[in-house]
């Protein structure tokens, strides 16, 4: 039985040209996390594997950086980065948990951040 829950940064906004940290955290389960995938819609951004570390997709190498922790930092944001992002936790023995974050990239300087995780 899957008892875990994923907390995420929720709906967040950031300024064009800036950077943002996407964070998820799996709690309420003793399952071992073996890998975390970060995806944007259907595109794989990055993988963090418990044994092999990080792999950033080549097409995102210049704008995506791993961390903090299992989070992901997106840099040089453009309006095209607006959309859904998913953190997919592969665990044993529970299986897969998925968290969703919606990022809106704004032209103006009125970007507000989600409250659950604090973004620098």
């Amino acid at each position: 039985m899957m008892t875990g829950t994923i907390e995420t940064t929720g709906n967040i906004s950031a300024e064009k040209g800036g950077s943002i940290i996407l964070q998820c955290h799996l709690s309420s389960t003793t399952a071992q996390v073996t890998q975390v995938n970060w995806e944007q819609q259907d595109q794989l951004l990055a993988i963090c594997n418990a044994d092999l570390g990080w792999h950033i997709s080549p097409s995102f190498k210049d704008r995506v950086a791993p961390g903090p922790g299992l989070g992901l930092t997106l840099q040089s944001l453009t309006v095209n980065d607006t959309g859904e992002y998913f953190c997919i936790y592969h665990t044993y023995p529970d299986g897969t948990y998925t968290g969703r974050i919606f990022l809106e990239v704004l032209e103006s300087s009125v970007a507000e951040h989600g409250a659950r995780f604090q973004i620098p």
């Epitope: 907390e7 940290i21 955290h25 709690s27 003793t30 996390v33 975390v36 963090c48 594997n49 418990a50 092999l52 570390g53 990080w54 792999h55 950033i56 190498k61 210049d62 950086a65 791993p66 961390g67 903090p68 922790g69 299992l70 930092t73 840099q75 659950r116 995780f117 604090q118 973004i119 620098p120």
Partner: antibody
Framework: QAYLQQSGAELVRSGASVKMSCKAS????????MHWVKQTPGQGLEWIGY????????NYNQKFKGKATLTADTSSSTAYMQISSLTSEDSAVYFC??????????WGQGTSVTVSS | QIVLTQSPAIMSASPGEKVTMTCSAS?????MHWYQQKSGTSPKRWIY???KLASGVPVRFSGSGSGTSYSLTISSMEAEDAATYYC?????????FGAGTKLELK
């Protein structure tokens, strides 16, 4: 097995700069963040920042921006930290530590820096 | 930045005694890491993600907590457990460490 070998102790004059190294072995250097942590008897452990050697991305503690510069040479699997404009407050042991999402799992032995006036 | 307050700063325990130390965060954090450091050596990852034991850590250690309150417990103190234990958060930049709890053998 991952292993981080740090450069030796440094005795440097106030106002000068120091550059220390952290040579990684036993794992893929470009797949893990490399953190730097300062330890002093009075302040305990302080996180300075990290570099991701895979693309050179750095994330600094605001307190150390302009004071510390992190770089990495992927050809030699070595991370570096330069500390500039040294003062007595920079006298400390500096650790490098590997992190791949699940906390800092391997640490170097530390580099002791003593600033003399 | 989030301030982590560890208590007690120093404690002593006899072999076989149960030990609990705490780490209190100035703001809510999602998880906590713990490191063990013995005099003259580097810190070692000890407990990560609040409750997961690092490789090689004896099962007498456990971690728990949520929000602003976290703890590390040793079910039965042994001589080799004498060390300083640091908590660390990375819910927000910058990552911060507690000042440490020094555990001595009585």
């Amino acid at each position: 097995q991952a292993y981080l070998q740090q450069s030796g102790a440094e005795l440097v004059r106030s106002g000068a700069s120091v550059k220390m190294s952290c040579k990684a072995s036993g794992y893929t250097f470009t797949s893990y963040n490399m953190h730097w942590v300062k330890q002093t008897p009075g302040q305990g452990l302080e996180w300075i920042g990290y570099i991701y050697p895979g693309n050179g991305f750095t994330n600094y503690n605001q307190k150390f921006k302009g004071k510390a510069t992190l770089t990495a040479d992927t050809s030699s699997s070595t991370a570096y930290m330069q500390i500039s404009s040294l003062t007595s407050e920079d006298s400390a042991v500096y650790f490098c530590a590997r992190e791949g999402g699940w906390a800092m799992d391997y640490w170097g032995q530390g580099t002791s820096v003593t600033v003399s006036s | 930045q989030i301030v982590l307050t560890q208590s007690p700063a120093i404690m002593s325990a006899s072999p076989g005694e149960k030990v609990t130390m705490t780490c209190s965060a100035s703001s809510s954090v999602s998880h906590m890491h713990w490191y063990q450091q013995k005099s003259g050596t580097s810190p070692k990852r000890w407990i990560y993600d609040t409750s997961k034991l690092a490789s090689g850590v004896p099962v007498r250690f456990s971690g728990s907590g949520s929000g602003t309150s976290y703890s590390l417990t040793i079910s039965s103190m042994e001589a080799e457990d004498a060390a300083t234990y640091y908590c660390q958060q990375w819910n927000s930049n910058p990552s911060t460490f507690g000042a440490g709890t020094k555990l001595e053998l009585k």
